[in-house]
């Protein structure tokens, strides 16, 4: 049976340093005797889930496996049960621990909401920012590019740090940092546009710390379906935060009569959330929920971690699939409102737009759809995966693949419907986006399954870097470029403005199909990569001398 005391201790937060030191002394003694990192006195991170007999280990998926035995000639762990009940060990009530972990996940999800709220508050008042600073479209593009590039560059750095240092401190510092920068940016004088550009870059760095590290803490707090659920909540923060960002931006601007105030809301909330993270999020050890020993911290070099990740086929293919999602969402988000406006011009239900913002109403509808489909997609994806896990071990990547391939069909239908029916186009957008967003949380879960805890932050960071680099960093520009290229070879008319953009956007469903293929490829290797990760986790639970990852 599983060592319940250990399981409870694993979920608990940090205790006083004295008790911690005492437990470490005990653990060293137990390890010397047993050759395994017994559960005795396990602190926040818990032990390896080893029972009194020292024969069972909770794996990455939460299942129970036979623990690797110690070196020949070493005795078992007869003193384990006794030690666990000794004066130094604390066994908090499991219920309170569940609440603590739930609260931690809620705070981390709230932080993610704020991350996106902050990002999209700027999007919500972008026209005002452009007007105030006299920013041209290329300048607005620069703001976006600087943000994405700094985010991309910073993500691997925080991945490295997140696997080696105190994650909640890095998280809080990241939130405090972007909050301070965003707040300061609301006071930038009109003549210093370059300072605004710099501030967006710095915010990108701050937000990269959060996006990279927070999911790994959730991964270390929960396992199996609970982890899927918690990651779903965490990733639902993306559409929720984005939608709230737009709303906050426009409503605060209207209430205060000045767009500058819109940039002062999220920093205040950010400071509060950063403080709550420091207080309420337990100092979880890597592999916490996977029942690994307290010594679990990245001992391998960053280069070695990268090599291991690149050799992990499930991780590589799921990352490429994520890039496809990112490509499509980036391009559609940028161009669909204008495309639908041009469709209405062709249908004679709207006038040609000579004075931007063009398609403002379409932007609003599209924003609302994106927000709702984000929620629906995350819920649908998580639900479908839970159900499919009863049928197959490859449920996670297969659900993603089906979602992607289904999404591609409906994205194609947008361009068919738009010629005659805007409502039809919106229905296709709704279904297409729901299916596209259904893999958000599942992709994160796939990563947690196939990557060992000491590499998760690096893995999340590299995946984030890849998805931006191959995805939304270039897709809006590529679509615009293709559209212009088509228009140059045709006559200048509203019909060709509409058609050229439509033909350019047809690249999206092809990329999404490619993403679906990548998920199918992930499904091929998922079971073996998951097993390998679990095997490595079990090895990590052994004394340092025998660890090889």
């Amino acid at each position: 049976m599983m060592c319940l005391e250990c399981a409870s201790a694993a979920a608990g937060g940090a205790e006083e340093e004295e008790a911690d030191a005492e437990r470490r002394r005990r653990r060293r003694g137990a390890q010397r005797g047993a050759g395994g990192s017994g559960c005795c006195g396990a602190r926040g991170a818990g032990g390896a889930g080893v029972s009194a007999a020292g024969d069972e280990v909770q794996t990455l998926s939460g299942s129970v496996r036979r623990a690797p035995t110690g070196p020949p000639g070493t005795p078992g762990t007869p003193g384990c049960a006794a030690t666990a009940k000794g004066p130094g060990a604390q066994q908090p009530k499991p219920a309170s621990l569940g609440r603590g972990r739930g609260a931690a996940a809620a705070i981390l999800s709230l932080g993610n909401v704020l991350n996106y709220l902050d990002r999209y508050t700027v999007a919500g008042v972008l026209l005002d920012i452009q007007q105030h600073f006299g920013v041209k479209d290329r300048g607005a593009g620069l703001l976006q590019s600087v943000f994405i590039c700094s985010f991309m560059v910073a993500a691997p750095i925080f991945g490295y740090l997140g696997d080696r240092f105190n994650r909640k401190v890095i998280l809080s510092c990241g939130i405090f940092f972007w909050s301070a920068v965003t707040f300061s940016s609301s006071f930038i004088p009109q003549q210093y546009f370059w300072l605004l550009v710099l501030s967006r870059g710095l915010v990108g760095i701050g937000e990269a710390s959060y996006s990279t590290i927070a999911p790994t803490i959730i991964g270390d707090l929960f396992t199996k379906n609970t982890r899927t659920l918690m990651l779903s909540v965490f990733y639902f923060a993306i559409p929720l935060g984005s939608g709230l960002g737009y709303i906050t931006g426009s409503s605060v601007k209207q209430a205060a009569g000045d767009w500058h105030w819109a940039l002062r809301v999220s920093p205040v909330l950010g400071m509060i959330t950063g403080t709550l993270i420091l207080i309420l999020v337990p100092a979880t050890k890597r592999g916490h929920a996977d029942q690994l020993g307290d010594q679990l911290k990245a001992r391998t070099s960053w280069l070695r971690d990268m090599k291991a990740l690149i050799r992990n086929r499930s991780y590589v293919f799921s990352s490429l699939a994520t890039s496809a999602v990112s490509f499509a969402t980036g391009a559609l988000g940028m161009w669909i409102p204008l495309y639908l406006h041009r469709a209405q011009v062709v249908q004679k239900t709207a006038e040609t737009c000579n004075s931007p913002p063009c398609g403002a109403k379409d932007s609003l509808i599209f924003g609302a759809i994106t927000c709702f489909t984000g929620f629906l997609g995350v819920v649908t994806g998580a639900g479908a995966t839970r159900w499919c896990r009863l049928k197959t071990q490859r449920a996670d990547p297969l659900v993603c693949a089906v979602g992607m391939l289904g999404s591609a069909i409906f994205i194609c239908l947008i361009f068919v419907a738009a010629k005659s029916s805007i409502v039809g186009a919106y229905i296709c957008i709704f279904v297409g986006e729901t299916l596209l967003f259904s893999n958000w949380a599942i992709t994160a879960d796939i990563l947690m399954y196939v990557v060992i805890p000491t590499r998760r932050a690096t893995a999340v960071a590299l995946q984030s870097f890849t998805s931006h680099l191959l995805g939304d960093a270039g897709s809006p520009y590529l679509i615009g470029f293709i559209s212009d290229l088509i228009r140059q070879s045709t006559k200048d008319s509203p019909l060709w403005e509409f058609l050229s953009l439509g033909y350019a956007l047809m690249l999206c469903p092809f990329v999404v199909v490619l993403g679906g293929m990548f998920f199918l490829a992930t499904a091929l290797f998922f079971v073996s990569d998951r097993a390998r990760a679990e095997q490595q986790v079990n090895q990590l639970a052994m004394p340092p001398a025998s660890v090889k990852v």
Epitope: G134, V135, R138, G139, L142, P189, Q190, Q191, F193, S355
Partner: antibody, heavy 125, light 107 residues
Framework: EVQLVETGGGLVQPGSSLKLSCSTS????????MSWVRQAPGKGLEWVGL??????????NYAESVKGRFTISRDDSKRRVYLQMYTLRDQDTATYYC????????????????WGQGVMVTVSS | DIVLTQSPATLSVTPGESVSLSCRAS??????IHWYQQKSNESPRLLIK???QSMSGIPSRFSGSGSGTDFTLRINRVESEDFSVYYC?????????FGSGTKLEIK
């Protein structure tokens, strides 16, 4: 040397239309935002409106007093900016100046760094 | 719309004196204020941008200061060619607006 030359002014009756033209040289016109500013006889300066460049989709902004009656346009190939005035009123009588905004590639300023010599428009019956 | 109030409307000084011209905004506008000089029967010319940045070719006796709602154009030791009308202009918000002007005349 930067030069802005306005043409097309004159005496017109209330309710009629008039189109002013401003030809430019000495700077990268296609990248530069252009404004019209007017000055009634013996009075102060009043901004009429501005037109942005291609990279800002040729967006035009107007003062409330002329909105719906005046239209600013530009022709990058001819390096010209135009002010089309409809339904002219007595209070539109003024010297109209063509002005340029300093450009910084990614963004533009909202101050007027160069001014034309001005052209007189008189609205009277 | 942002209203700019210039004071005084007319300022009489003797050459060699130093003067300060005031411009007050109806709301905080950071440093988004610009100063122009308009000589009789001439087009205006830009003297100072963003409250304190002098334009090239402008004599060093012209300087600007201020932030928020109160701004000042200072002319150190006024010379004969400085007698003209001075306008402030805000660029914080559209529509762009000008002050009513301060006429600097010989005493």
């Amino acid at each position: 040397e930067v030069q802005l030359v306005e043409t097309g002014g004159g005496l017109v009756q209330p309710g009629s239309s008039l189109k002013l033209s401003c030809s430019t040289s000495g700077f990268t016109f296609s990248e530069t935002w252009m404004s019209w500013v007017r000055q009634a006889p013996g009075k102060g300066l009043e901004w009429v409106g501005l037109i942005k460049d291609k990279n800002s989709n040729y967006e035009a902004n107007y003062a409330e007093s002329v909105k719906g009656r005046f239209t600013i346009s530009r022709d990058d190939s001819k390096r010209r900016v135009y002010l089309q005035m409809y339904t002219l009123r007595d209070q539109d009588t003024a010297t109209y100046y063509c002005t340029s905004h300093e450009d910084f590639y990614y963004y533009s300023s909202y101050y007027f760094d160069y001014w034309g010599q001005g052209v007189m428009v008189t609205v009277s019956s | 719309d942002i209203v700019l109030t210039q004071s005084p409307a007319t300022l009489s000084v003797t050459p060699g004196e130093s003067v300060s011209l005031s411009c007050r905004a109806s709301q905080g506008i950071s440093t988004s204020i610009h100063w122009y000089q308009q000589k009789s029967n001439e087009s205006p010319r830009l003297l100072i941008k963003y409250a304190s940045q002098s334009m090239s070719g402008i004599p060093s006796r012209f300087s600007g200061s201020g932030s928020g709602t109160d701004f000042t154009l200072r002319i150190n030791r006024v010379e004969s060619e400085d007698f003209s009308v001075y306008y402030c202009q805000q660029s914080y918000n559209l529509p762009l607006t000008f002050g009513s002007g301060t006429k600097l005349e010989i005493k």
